[in-house]
Amino acid sequence: ATKLTEEKYELKEGQTLDVKCDYTLEKFASSQKAWQIIRDGEMPKTLACTERPSKNSHPVQVGRIILEDYHDHGLLRVRMVNLQVEDSGLYQCVIYQPPKEPHMLFDRIRLVVTKGFSGTPGSNENSTQNVYKIPPTTTKALCPLYTSPRTVTQAPPKSTADVSTPDSEINLTNVTDIIRVPVFN
């Protein structure tokens, strides 16, 4: 079987993961995209997804995850803000194309989050608690649930459950430096 490549991101608590998954523009521009975690001995779990059809440059937030799909560039931008140690794991971007199986985008992301040192962002637990806010235009969206080919076009999103957004502003251009190490599964 083909070995899937990984990119390793090493970050500290409170920092922001900012990755871009590229896809074939012509095929998948308006397809729904999702961000999944793959834990050892587990099936992939979808944590957040774009709307359906996916809107261009329209931020979608689920918890601390923000997705933005740039159709013009064939890029899905994924940000996880205020990282926690328990966020460590293997992640992947996928494209939903019901009723066909999801299409995986490579490379997978190996995220390692460590405790912050004194004086670095995230070292004070309280200081990062209310640091991030998504602009008011952000959509709060959850993945709608596919039932069958006959109903998929009519099915509305299953839920728009509450997602809390803390109070201060996030500077979207000021993302902490990361270490990227290509590794293999």
Epitope: K45, L47, V62, R64, L145, Y146, T147, A161, V163, S164
Partner: antibody, heavy 121, light 113 residues
Framework: QVQLVESGGGVVQPGRSLRLSCAAS????????MHWVRQAPGKGLEWVAV????????YYADSVKGRFTISRDNSKNTLYLQMNSLRAEDTAVYYC??????????????WGQGTMVTVSS | DIVMTQSPDSLAVSLGERATINCKSS????????????LAWYQQKPGQPPKLLIY???TRESGVPDRFSGSGSGTDFTLTISSLQAEDVAVYYC?????????FGGGTKVEIK
């Protein structure tokens, strides 16, 4: 409509084998991970195994690991559970169950009616 | 493995009265990154497979009457039937899908007093 129909249950002696089947219809079977869940008589539910949509990943409960094998034939829209070295404690109704397409909830919205497996000498 | 503990084992409630079932997990089932609790509730009637009622701890499955509600976060969860109807007599199970192996609570039998 969406349907799962299990078959292959019956009475079997300890140490013997049995193969359960689950025939799926009304949805694109090849796009879904599929699970087996069992329920001993008068008892609660116990998750048994899961297989990914393409069969490349399989995970098992510790109680059946090394004895049971989950598999699928997408061309036949059928899920299987090969049960070897059966024990009395494997006696249960076996359900196949389907999670949602997005696997975002990890719960089962479609269940079969179940097939009874009795392990007895 | 995450152990799910339900209480009480059985519950007798008068028609129209409130029924409350508790479920406790041995570790948190919250994914903090998306703020979702991977906890579901099922209803099972004799001779039938389970039926999904609630997922993500508090989101009702479509078609489920609004007298069923779920609450809680982290490790402590509750299923409430606000006004018990005769057709609600069943066994109710909680289930975590935070991590493999998926695990269920032992069940709570709800009867009419």
């Amino acid at each position: 409509q969406v349907q799962l129909v299990e078959s292959g249950g019956g009475v079997v002696q300890p140490g013997r084998s049995l193969r359960l089947s689950c025939a799926a219809s009304g949805f694109t079977f090849s796009s879904y991970g599929m699970h087996w869940v069992r329920q001993a008589p008068g008892k609660g539910l116990e998750w048994v195994a899961v297989i990914s949509y393409d069969g490349s990943n399989k995970y098992y409960a510790d109680s059946v690991k090394g004895r049971f094998t989950i598999s699928r034939d997408n061309s036949k829209n059928t899920l299987y559970l090969q049960m070897n070295s059966l024990r009395a404690e494997d006696t249960a109704v076996y359900y196949c169950a389907r999670p949602d397409y997005y696997s975002s909830r990890g719960v089962f919205d479609i269940w079969g009616q179940g097939t009874m497996v009795t392990v007895s000498s | 493995d995450i152990v799910m503990t339900q209480s009480p084992d059985s519950l007798a409630v008068s028609l129209g009265e409130r029924a409350t079932i508790n479920c406790k997990s041995s570790q948190s089932v919250l994914y903090s990154s998306n703020n979702k609790n991977y906890l579901a509730w099922y209803q099972q009637k004799p001779g039938q497979p389970p039926k999904l009622l609630i997922y993500w701890a508090s989101t009702r499955e479509s078609g489920v009457p609004d007298r069923f509600s779920g609450s809680g976060s982290g490790t402590d969860f509750t299923l409430t039937i606000s006004s018990l109807q005769a057709e609600d007599v069943a066994v109710y199970y909680c289930q975590q899908s935070h991590s493999t192996p998926l695990t269920f609570g032992g069940g709570t039998k709800v009867e009419i007093k």
